[in-house]
């Protein structure tokens, strides 16, 4: 069957969530096949490990692709110590990694 590379999006935490004292940054991969994909988080260009969780949807009934969300969870205090948040995605259909990022406070 055919390969579909993911579309990648990054979402900062909501103001409402920040008020609760935590910060979740979400990297969303949409409509990809096959299922294997790798997401790496970087904060101010430093690789993060151990503080993210992934959730993969089942295959879409229409086009048999997958979606995946990776959530980086930090305390509000840690979140506000840093500026640049990025997720880097690799997939067999991509010739080079796709990176999506945002600068805290500018979105």
């Amino acid at each position: 069957r055919t390969v579909a590379a993911p579309s990648v999006f990054i979402f900062p935490p909501s103001d409402e969530q920040l008020k609760s004292g935590t910060a979740s940054v979400v990297c969303l991969l949409n409509n990809f096949y096959p299922r294997e994909a790798k997401v790496q988080w970087k904060v101010d260009n430093a690789l993060q490990s151990g503080n993210s969780q992934e959730s993969v949807t089942e295959q879409d009934s229409k086009d048999s692709t997958y979606s995946l969300s990776s959530t980086l969870t930090l305390s509000k205090a840690d979140y506000e110590k840093h500026k640049v948040y990025a997720c880097e995605v690799t997939h067999q259909g991509l010739s080079s990694p796709v990176t999506k990022s945002f600068n805290r406070g500018e979105c």
Epitope: E36, A37, K38, H91
Partner: nanobody
């Protein structure tokens, strides 16, 4: 140091066939996915096909599905791309690449130098 060497490119008429080879040295390919990409002038490099580990199948780009077949010979440390019913839009430099891990993550750490395929009458 891993080295990948493509061969088999050339000039072919529309509707013709070519078989590309990619010979690997410095790493035993049997545990890794081997992929083919191509790059046409002025365009981004695009995925063509991947041969996963033996038994895990092969996958293709929509544009080549049914015309191209990827295969591998782990004993020879070589992957092949059989290209049939070639079209002018298949004209490009074809590259092979090897996954950096066994997870099929698409982290391509080594690339060949490429072989030119030109489809023209």
């Amino acid at each position: 140091q891993v080295q990948l060497q493509e061969s088999g490119g050339g000039l072919v008429q529309p509707g013709g066939s070519l078989r590309l080879s990619c010979a690997a040295s410095g790493r035993t390919i049997s545990r890794y996915a081997m992929s083919w990409f191509r790059q046409a002038p002025g365009k981004e490099r695009e995925f063509v096909a991947v041969a996963r580990r033996s038994g895990d199948g092969a996958f293709y780009a929509d544009s080549v599905q049914g015309r191209f077949t990827v295969s591998r010979d782990d004993a020879k440390n070589t992957v092949y791309l059989q290209m049939n019913s070639l079209k002018p839009e298949d004209t490009a430099v074809y590259y092979c690449a090897i996954d950096s891990d066994t997870f099929y993550s698409g982290s391509y750490d080594y690339w060949g130098q490429g072989t030119q395929v030109t489809v023209s009458s």
